[in-house]
């Protein structure tokens, strides 16, 4: 399955929107910085098959979408930017979903990279718990916004590797 070029453009648009969503200076939130342990090895496109990599990408985007679809998120961000950002993610999910469905149909026994999926899930669990502990403060959301920009950048790199594999 070939991810359309528009998918990468969508990812870049999502990054731009996320950058625009920043409301407060990151420098005023230095005390709230946190290492969420982004599972960078899961974004090494050479580590596993393309099908599995797409599943990891899907999980990453799906968890990001869910994170920014909460009531707490709606209260934290400018509504029109948040809606545009969510729309970009939703479109990416559609693209990835179509790819995974196509690959699943072609496989005898669909291989699931369980540990990679779990690593992504645990990463977002840490983010969720951080927000809860910080009571969804503006600085906590700013730290999370910066972290998601970082993770989306990694997923962009993974997509580039996948396109080279075609």
């Amino acid at each position: 399955c070939d991810l359309p070029q528009t998918h990468s453009l969508g990812n870049r648009r999502a990054l731009i929107l996320l950058a625009q969503m920043g409301r407060i200076s990151p420098f005023s939130c230095l005390k709230d910085r946190h290492d969420f342990g982004l599972p960078q090895e899961e974004f090494d496109g050479n580590q596993f098959q393309k099908t599995q990599a797409i599943s990891v990408l899907h999980e990453m985007i799906q968890q990001t979408f869910n994170l920014f679809s909460t009531e707490d998120s709606s209260a934290a961000w400018e509504q029109s930017l948040l809606e545009k950002f969510s729309t970009e993610l939703y479109q990416q999910l559609n693209n990835l979903e179509a790819c995974v469905i196509q690959e699943v149909g072609m496989e005898e026994t669909p291989l699931m990279n369980e540990d990679s999926i779990l690593a992504v899930r645990k990463y977002f669990q840490r983010i969720t718990l951080y927000l809860t502990e910080k009571k969804y403060s503006p600085c906590a959301w700013e730290v999370v916004r910066a972290e998601i920009m970082r993770s989306l950048s990694f997923s962009t790199n993974l997509q580039k590797i996948l396109r080279r594999k075609d």
């Epitope: 599943s55 999980e59 968890q63 699943v104 540990d115 779990l118 899930r121 669990q125 718990l129 809860t132």
Partner: antibody
Framework: QVQLVQSGAEVKKPGASVKVSCKAS????????MHWVRQAPGQGLEWMGE????????IYAQKFQGRVTMTRDTSTSTVYMELSSLRSEDTAVYYC????????????WGQGTLVTVSS | EIVLTQSPATLSLSPGERATLSCSAG???????LYWYQQKPGQAPRLLIY???NLASGIPARFSGSGSGTDFTLTISSLEPEDFAVYYC?????????FGQGTKLEIK
Amino acid sequence: QVQLVQSGAEVKKPGASVKVSCKASGYTFRNYWMHWVRQAPGQGLEWMGEINPSHGRTIYAQKFQGRVTMTRDTSTSTVYMELSSLRSEDTAVYYCARGGLGPAWFAYWGQGTLVTVSS
Amino acid sequence: EIVLTQSPATLSLSPGERATLSCSAGSSVDSSELYWYQQKPGQAPRLLIYSTSNLASGIPARFSGSGSGTDFTLTISSLEPEDFAVYYCHQWSSYPFTFGQGTKLEIK
């Protein structure tokens, strides 16, 4: 509000198959993995596996690999769990439970479906 | 597979007393992925505590959780009549996800 409604009780003969359904409502169906957990009479809880309703990918517990099949129908927001080659030890209440993160993990359960395997 | 062993299997106490339930993991579990559930006869399990020590929505403050690594504890500070049920610990730190065998909390 989030609701998971399961199909009714089933009685099956050893060697047969059973297919239990779980209809979701009150949230975006495709966004959350759905899990299946079973409980034999008077026993504890046992995780069977999970399915991503978005694309249908599954992760099964090794114990059930080869005997369980989880599927979904996005048009009706329903997930299915089929267990084949039934034996008496499979007599249990089968639950679907929605995944999520933090306080949302297994915060929502179906009402349970009793499957009785008897000759 | 991470085996979760709960103790005691049955705990007989009176309303107003303090209950301490233990959950021991066969190998280390990330505290973020250790949960506790309550189950009453004929009902589905109900989420009590998530990530070792966080109270789920609507759960009274008499419930608390603690622990790390391989040893986790659920404490009920002063038992109410509605607290008598079966309690399960659960981990999703690694596949396959597992539950403890349960602790039945019964009225003395």
